[in-house]
């Protein structure tokens, strides 16, 4: 039979400038001598010769004189190749071809890597900064390989993904310099961290900058809302929290509070000229009048509907003003699925049946999963449709076409992705012939 040549399955990772060993081995037969051995290392893609051993002799390196075999180990079946002073250009697949009585070959991958330097951070503009100013923060890290992954986050560890531009340029050696630019609107103060990750080495290089802007000439009102969406069930009441810090001596006569829909700017509720101007939103909103003086500008939204979903802006004006937007995520649980079978009688193994799983009046759209009695997912031949009713709630119908075995259980799981609520239904089909549902 053909000769079995063994190489590592995983790529060999080598740092730029270091030496790497590309392992390759074969099993010599009894009585094997090096005179019989023909060993060729080449680049897999281009077939360029790298190194060879033939006619009982090392034929030397054909690859910039940077390769060597392990001559003392060849007779034991060790055909490994030593590659010195690894460069980025060496990355790729190398084929180890061994020929004795028969022949065989295998390819080993070389993955080159270089760690990234600790990032340096620059700020533009870098003086006279005020809350509300837009600044450009540049994070630069050098001489890494392969291309980096760059992550930005704020002082609370929350990822910052918007307004990031990252560029990576390779130098003559093929090493990358990475420059990532974050454009951010300053708050009262903030820490911005940049993490440059080498995906091969799983090496992270971090830097951060803390910006404490000057107090603006007339300090804007800082309005606080929850970062995460407020989740409310259809038909229940929801509180959209919003708060500000009243100055000493603050009176409600100074307060102007406006709630509106962020996108359309439609007025929802307002408090101006020292009094609650009431709901402009189907009379389903209310403030917390007893708490306003303490800086609680929250809005109560009654009998939540699907159409309420979206972003609401809380705008507070006193001596100065500020605003923040809070998201309302509406949800409704799905009903326990009902299961139907077609055909539903005289079923035999080998028959194709259609199993329908129906679940009603949920929101938002469901995720539907099918599995067999062993918990193995069933993904082929599934058709799922979701229809919204007048209230915007979805009825979901998922159809599985399956060929019956001797017996089997088929489960349908309807998941509400917001509530992380799972509604299950299952049907077990046994015996033959059989009828569904079973007759009493």
């Amino acid at each position: 039979g053909a000769l079995e040549v063994q190489v590592p399955e995983d790529p060999v990772v080598a740092l730029v400038g270091t030496d790497a060993t590309l392992c390759c081995s074969f099993s010599p037969e009894p009585g094997f001598s090096l005179a019989q051995l023909n060993l060729i290392w080449q680049l897999t893609d281009t077939k360029q010769l790298v190194h060879s051993f033939a006619e009982g002799q090392d034929q030397g390196s054909a690859y910039a004189n940077r390769t060597a075999l392990f001559p003392d180990l060849l007779a034991q079946g060790n055909a490994s190749l030593r590659l010195q002073r690894v460069r980025v250009a060496d990355e790729g697949s190398f084929t180890c071809f061994v020929s004795i009585r028969d022949f065989g070959s295998a390819a080993v991958s070389l993955q080159v890597a270089a760690p990234y330097s600790k990032p340096s951070m620059t700020l533009e503009p870098n003086k006279d900064l005020r809350p509300g100013d837009t600044v450009t923060i540049t994070c630069s890290s050098y001489q890494g390989y392969p291309e980096a992954e760059v992550f930005w986050q704020d002082g609370q560890g929350v990822p910052l993904t918007g307004n990031v531009t990252t560029s990576q340029m390779a130098n003559e050696q093929g090493l990358f310099d990475v420059h990532s630019i974050l454009r951010v609107v300053l708050g009262a103060n903030g820490t911005y961290s940049c993490l440059v990750r080498n995906p091969v080495l799983q090496q992270d290089a971090h830097s951060s900058v803390t910006i404490t802007p000057q107090r603006s000439p007339t300090g804007a009102v800082e309005v606080q809302v929850p970062e995460d969406p407020v989740v409310a069930l259809v038909g229940t009441d929801a509180t959209l929290r919003c708060s500000f810090s009243p100055e000493p001596g603050f009176s409600l006569a100074q307060l102007n509070l406006i709630w509106q829909l962020t996108d359309t700017k439609q007025l929802v509720h307002s408090f101006t000229e020292g009094r609650d101007q009431g709901s402009a939103y189907a009379n389903r909103t209310a403030l917390f009048p007893d708490l306003l003086a303490q800086g609680n500008a929250s809005l109560r939204l009654q009998r939540v509907r699907v159409a309420d979903e979206g972003s609401f802006t809380c705008f507070v004006s006193i001596r100065d003003f500020g605003s923040a937007a809070v998201s309302l995520q509406v949800a409704a649980p799905y009903s326990k699925p009902s299961m139907t079978l077609e055909p539903n009688k005289d079923l035999r193994p080998g028959d194709t049946v259609t199993i329908t799983c129906s679940s009603y009046r949920g929101y938002p759209e469901a995720e539907v999963f099918w599995q067999d009695g062993q918990g193995v997912p069933l993904t082929g031949n599934v058709t799922t449709s979701q229809m919204a009713n007048e209230q915007g709630l979805f009825d979901v119908h998922s159809v599985l076409r399956v060929v019956l075995g001797a017996n089997g259980t088929y489960s349908c799981l309807v998941r509400n992705p917001v509530l992380q609520q799972d509604a299950h239904g299952s049907v077990t089909i046994t015996g033959q012939p059989m009828t569904f549902p079973p007759e009493a």
Epitope: G132, T313, S317, F321
Partner: antibody, heavy 119, light 109 residues
Framework: QVQLQQSGAEVKKPGSSVKVSCKAS????????ISWVRQAPGQGLEWMGG????????NYAQKFQGRVTITADESTSTAYMELSSLRSEDTAVYYC????????????WGQGTMVTVSS | EIVLTQSPATLSLSPGERATLSCRAS??????LAWYQQKPGQAPRLLIY???NRATGIPARFSGSGSGTDFTLTISSLEPEDFAVYYC???????????FGQGTKLEIK
């Protein structure tokens, strides 16, 4: 730092309209309060109206009510002031001004746009 | 509509002297009052906001005082670059609207 850049000088006929633009850079435009102030030659400052883009609410001085329209385009960070039914007394330098994010005091001003109304 | 009356209309003083400019409102404006300086051919410059707070970069010789209906801008020792026109301005609570006084011209004697 916030900057306001206004459109160029205009010469208009009586009875026509003029629309002056004011582009903001270096901050969060939607959270500004933008005011429009004019100054006739040798005269004092006159507040015409203003807008807070995040609210989309504009309000106007009584004197200009019905003749001035102030709008804001958040996508381009630009505010506009349109004055209609122009007369010779409307010849003036028109300024946009803001306090930047969340501030009412007008500490940032555009360079001014000269509007001349002449037949 | 609130009317702001500034006095005097013109004030003639010499460098080094103290200047006191007055602004009176026809009804209470709380403390939402600002002072601006304007030189020929230039946009106005904010000096004082909320009656008594100096804006960024404004020298300490400028100070504001007052509340309700009577307000004062004081320049403790006039510098040559201080000769200009000064305007007071009030802001109504809601919706935010502004009124300027007619101005006081501060000229070199």
């Amino acid at each position: 730092q916030v900057q306001l850049q206004q459109s160029g000088a205009e010469v208009k006929k009586p009875g026509s309209s003029v629309k002056v633009s004011c582009k903001a850079s270096g901050g969060t435009f939607s959270s500004y309060a933008i005011s429009w102030v004019r100054q006739a030659p040798g005269q004092g400052l006159e507040w015409m109206g203003g807008i807070i883009p995040i609210l989309g609410i504009a309000n106007y001085a009584q004197k200009f009510q019905g003749r001035v329209t102030i709008t804001a385009d958040e996508s381009t960070s630009t505010a506009y002031m349109e004055l209609s039914s122009l007369r010779s007394e409307d010849t003036a330098v028109y300024y946009c001004a803001t306090g930047g994010s969340g501030r009412y005091a007008l500490d940032i001003w555009g360079q001014g746009t000269m509007v001349t109304v002449s037949s | 509509e609130i009317v702001l009356t500034q006095s005097p209309a013109t004030l003639s003083l010499s460098p080094g002297e103290r200047a006191t400019l007055s602004c009176r409102a026809s009804q209470s404006v709380s403390s939402y009052l600002a002072w601006y300086q304007q030189k020929p051919g230039q946009a106005p410059r904010l000096l004082i906001y909320d009656a008594s707070n100096r804006a960024t970069g404004i020298p300490a010789r400028f100070s504001g005082s007052g509340s309700g209906t009577d307000f004062t801008l004081t320049i403790s020792s006039l510098e040559p670059e201080d000769f200009a026109v000064y305007y007071c301005q009030q802001r109504s609570n809601w919706p935010p609207s502004y009124t300027f006084g007619q101005g006081t011209k501060l000229e070199i004697k």
